[in-house]
């Protein structure tokens, strides 16, 4: 009797399953008792003899190329063998790399966690992700693994990963990149600082006097508000970044605390008082302002 | 700033295998995130890329030349080199190696060698 | 492979002209286009990455711009140094491959 081996799939993908039938077209195996055993090069596949013809394998790997047969042995003890069948398990290459953030956006506040997700649409068996950081390709990890997404994590977000990033990914058919994604580090503003500019050392009534408030660090933009014992004199705003003024006609109902408050969206800080005070010098005629 | 030079003879026989290293300086070659390449031209001609080294042994080839092309390194010499094989008078070119930054674009080359293939 | 052709082979043109060569990808390679400046004898030298990185060091008369298929190097007012021959190369797709070269001569 002749023995044959038959795989369905004859040519299978990376990670599908693959049914190994050892058949005898002249003799049903209910004919007699048979235990079969499946081979590939040289080792046996799965549990060894059984009395069933087939094996099932869950998920062929590329690895897993090369040549397989299947024996068959009766109650007599004798063995047929079949022919050696060459199986070919074919890898797909990676296709369609994309890169995507956790939070969705690429915003992310400082402090906070950021993941960047590199994914491929296709592609089987081991994939190598890179993860690079500018178009300059900082290369800031890579993972080789079987699936299809891969992770990067930078656990505490700073001012300095505001960059573009990319992955890429290859599978041993060439590296393909994804897009350029960018991030955006969103930075709450810090404690604002005010200083009062006057024309001279000492203001006088109707004198100009400039208040200026700045937050040092704090995406834009930023709205100002602007403070006189606590009444709101009015706003202004930085669409760029750095500081705001606001210029005020002096009175001598001026005197007093002053304050500033930035705002970015992110939170509000308030600065500390300037107190300015009216003082009479001896002999002058003019009220005169320190601060 | 890194630099490449390309070394090797500049002529090569028929059949024969043609054989050129690259010494990179001011950076090492194990450094991550840059792909070590060959690049050729014609004479008169356009780019042909033939393939890199990078991951400390890892290569990649262009389908086109693949069974006749080995990229090899030498990191304690901070080298990597070029065998191709069965030459032909089609392989004359000018040759060049260069530093692939993140599989996207080379930002250092080589000043190249010209590689006459004639017997 | 991805074919990249490029858009003039070559053009005459005088110093302070502006010069615009184009590249066109066989299918869309996101942003992954660069272009560089080759002189007779000499090697390539990078320009522009990402379809609109410039390089450091290049002049900023120098810009690219362009995603997907059609990508285009801008040389606002050509000098002196700037004939040569430029070619454009993607990355989106291995093997990495280069247009055929737009030469800028002098008229």
């Known amino acids: 009797a002749e023995l044959f081996l038959i795989a369905s799939p004859s040519h299978p993908t990376e990670g599908s399953p693959v049914t190994l039938t050892c058949k005898m077209p002249f003799l049903q195996s209910s004919d007699a008792q048979f235990q079969f055993c499946f081979f590939r090069d040289t080792r046996a596949l799965g549990p060894g003899w059984s009395s069933s013809p087939k094996l099932q394998i869950a998920a062929m790997w590329k690895e897993d190329t090369g040549s397989y047969w299947c024996e068959a042995q009766t109650m007599a003890s004798k063995v047929l063998r079949s022919r050696r069948s060459q199986i070919n398990v074919h890898r797909v290459p990676v296709a369609d790399v994309s890169l995507e953030t956790q939070p969705p956006g690429g915003q992310v506040m400082e402090g906070d966690r950021l993941v960047l997700i590199c994914s491929v649409a296709m592609g089987t068996g081991d994939i190598t992700f890179l993860w690079y950081k500018g178009a300059v390709g900082l290369n800031l990890q890579s993972k080789t693994q079987r699936s299809l997404t891969a992770e990067y994590e930078i656990p505490s977000v700073r001012e300095s990963d505001a960059e573009q990033y990319y992955c890429v990914a290859e599978n041993g058919y060439g590296p393909s990149p994804s897009g350029l994604v960018s991030i955006t580090v969103r930075i709450p503003v810090s404690r604002p600082i005010l200083m009062l500019r006057a024309p001279r050392a000492q203001a006088a009534v109707e004198d100009v006097l400039e208040l200026h408030c700045e937050a040092l660090r704090g995406s834009p933009p930023i709205l100002y508000w602007f403070y006189h014992e606590d009444i709101t004199l009015g706003s202004r705003s930085a669409p760029s970044g750095g500081g705001a003024s606001f210029n005020l006609s002096l009175t001598e109902e001026h005197s007093g605390n002053y304050s500033c408050e930035a705002n970015n969206g992110l939170g509000a800080q308030r600065s500390e008082a300037v107190t300015l005070n009216f003082t009479v010098p001896t002999g002058a005629r003019s009220n005169h302002l320190t601060s | 700033q890194v630099q490449l030079q390309e070394s090797g003879p500049g002529l090569v026989k028929p059949s024969q295998t043609l054989s050129l290293t690259c010494t990179v300086s001011?950076?090492?070659?194990?450094?991550?995130?840059?792909?070590w390449s060959w690049i050729r031209q014609h004479p008169g001609k356009g780019l042909e890329w033939i393939g890199y080294i990078y991951n400390s042994g890892s290569t990649y080839y262009n389908p086109s030349l693949k069974s006749r092309v080995t990229i090899s390194e030498d990191t304690s010499k901070n080298q990597f080199s070029l065998k191709l094989s069965s030459v032909t008078a089609a392989d004359s070119a000018v040759y060049y190696c260069a530093r692939l930054v993140g599989v996207t674009y080379f930002d250092c080359w080589g000043q190249g060698t010209l590689v006459t293939v004639s017997s | 492979d991805i074919q990249m052709t490029q858009s003039p082979s070559s053009v005459s043109t005088s110093v302070g002209d502006r010069v615009t060569i184009t590249c066109r990808a066989s299918?869309?390679?996101?942003?992954?286009l660069a272009w560089y400046q080759q002189k007779p004898g000499k090697a390539p030298k990078l320009l522009i990455y990402a379809a609109s990185s410039l390089q450091s060091g290049v002049p900023s008369r120098f810009s690219g711009s362009g995603s997907g298929t059609d990508f285009t190097l801008t040389i606002s007012s050509l000098q002196p140094e700037d004939f040569a021959t430029y070619y454009c190369q993607q990355a989106n797709s291995f093997p990495p491959t280069f247009g055929q070269g737009t030469k800028v001569e002098i008229k």
């Open positions: 001011g950076g090492s070659i194990s450094s991550g995130g840059y792909h």
């Open positions: 299918q869309g390679i996101r942003s992954w």
